[in-house]
């Protein structure tokens, strides 16, 4: 593993893919989506200490003006790299359609 | 203002672009950038509450279970939504360069 | 594990009407739709239509528009599948399968039902 | 409707051999394609969903590619159980539409 994937914080406290478990109804789109009624969520979770993921110089820049000034700056966060589609299954006005979403589940993480 | 653009918690506290004061010393550059020896540096800080310049419908999401499992599930987190390019000059092997980097300074922000 | 269970096989009259099951277990039924697909002899699969067990909302396929009814009883998580105004070309296996799930998959298939149409 | 063209209709092959099964979409589906393995008697059994994920308990032989419109199933070592029919199946609009399938045979 490259130095920025290996978390110094322990195994699985670093900015890292997590799936989580959720319903229509946790989502808030029980109104609209008629199916699946449940979903793996994968999202990007964890804490991105210096030199971690991080996705570009600005990320670096985040992290040493976060070094000096903590209470100004925060550290750099957790987020998507890159999306995977989903499909899901929702009321038209004309009755049913599979309707794809690009930016709903993440794909990868780093940190920015 | 688009609702979404209304900050709930009072002016200035939610995801924003922030301009921080900076010398190549502070952001560690001071070994290998000549010039500009101080930077204006543009960053994305503030809060995300609901709905506030949510990026996509990740972010819908992400806010959604935030509410219901903050232990597990983080809040959005105020991110570039774009850069501006910058233009440093840098010592190379054989003298001097004008090099433009693309992913230094944010432009605008969202929640992701 | 995840299993669809079909009813067993027909043998009916040409203008008669048959109503297949397909009884779920393992999973919540409520949480995916069932899809109906038929394989005549010797042929390929053809898609018939799906349901939400959840709502009862329906997608049809176009030639089988106004024969077919799909059906469900969340009581007994079981799916139900008629086709009326039998011909012989209608002469199939008729499988359910669950889905499709957040990535468009199709992944637990019935064992499927034999319905011959024969004078 | 989507159609799908699945080429060949039927190839002759040996165990160890390297099996490739085109499916053409008659527009872009994305990655909303599956493939699916049939015996005689029996139902379809899924291989690969999205166009590349292998569904699991599926052996790592079998692989798939493509978005859009051309998709690959790739059987990389046949093995004597894999001679059988296979479907690629788009589900990125109704009505669902299944290619005409690849009939895997012994040479």
């Known amino acids: 593993a490259r130095n920025g994937d290996r978390c110094p914080l322990g195994p699985g406290r670093c900015c890292r893919l997590h799936t989580v478990h959720a319903s229509l109804e946790d989502l808030g789109w029980a109104d609209w989506v008629l199916s699946p009624r449940e979903v793996q969520v994968t999202m990007c979770i964890g804490a991105c200490p210096s030199q971690f993921r991080e996705a570009n110089m600005h990320a670096q820049i985040k992290m040493n003006l976060h070094r000096l000034k903590p209470d100004t700056v925060p550290a750099p966060c957790c987020v998507p790299a890159s999306y995977n589609p989903m499909v899901l299954i929702q009321k038209t006005d004309t009755g049913v359609s599979l309707q794809t979403y690009d930016d709903l589940l993440a794909k990868d993480c780093h940190c920015v | 203002a688009r609702n979404g653009d209304r900050c709930p918690l009072g002016p200035g506290r939610c995801c924003r672009l922030h301009t921080v004061h900076a010398s190549l010393e502070d952001l560690g550059w001071a070994d290998w950038v000549l010039s500009p020896r101080e930077v204006q540096v543009t960053m994305c800080i503030g809060a995300c509450p609901s709905q506030f310049r949510e990026a996509n419908m990740h972010a819908q999401i992400k806010m959604n279970l935030h509410r219901l499992k903050p232990d597990t599930v983080p809040a959005p987190c105020c991110v570039p939504a774009s850069y501006n390019p910058m233009v440093l000059i840098q010592k190379t092997d054989t003298g001097v360069s004008l090099q433009t980097y693309d992913d230094l300074l944010a432009k605008d922000c969202h929640c992701v | 594990q995840v299993q669809l269970v079909q009813s067993g096989a027909e043998v009916k009259k040409p203008g008669a009407s048959v109503k297949v099951s397909c009884k779920a277990s393992?999973?919540?039924?409520?949480?995916?739709?069932i899809n109906w697909v038929r394989q005549a002899p010797g042929q390929g699969l053809e898609w018939m239509g799906w349901?939400?067990?959840?709502?009862?909302?329906?997608n049809y396929a176009q030639k089988l528009q106004g024969r077919v009814t799909m059906t469900t009883d969340t009581s007994t998580s079981t799916a139900y599948m008629e086709l009326r105004s039998l011909r012989s070309d209608d002469t199939a296996v008729y499988y359910c399968?669950?889905?499709?799930?957040?990535?468009?998959?199709?992944?637990?298939w019935g064992q499927g039902t034999m319905v011959t149409v024969s004078s | 409707d989507i159609q799908m063209t699945q080429s060949p209709s039927s190839v002759s092959a040996s165990v160890g051999d390297r099996v490739t099964i085109t499916c053409r979409a008659s527009?872009?589906?994305?990655?909303?394609l599956a493939w699916y393995q049939q015996k005689p008697g029996k139902a379809p059994k899924l291989l690969i969903y999205?166009?590349?994920s292998l569904q699991s308990g599926v052996p790592s032989r079998f692989s798939g590619s493509g978005s859009g419109t051309d998709f690959t199933l790739t059987i990389s070592s046949l093995q004597p159980e894999d001679f059988a029919t296979y479907y690629c199946?788009?589900?990125?609009?109704?009505?669902?539409?299944f290619g005409g399938g690849t009939k895997v045979e012994i040479k």
């Open positions: 349901i939400t067990a959840y709502s009862g909302d329906t």
């Open positions: 999205a166009a590349s």
């Open positions: 393992g999973y919540t039924f409520t949480s995916y739709g």
């Open positions: 199946q788009q589900a990125s609009q109704f009505p669902i539409t």
């Open positions: 527009q872009g589906i994305s990655s909303w």
């Open positions: 399968a669950r889905g499709p799930g957040q990535y468009a998959d199709v992944d637990v």
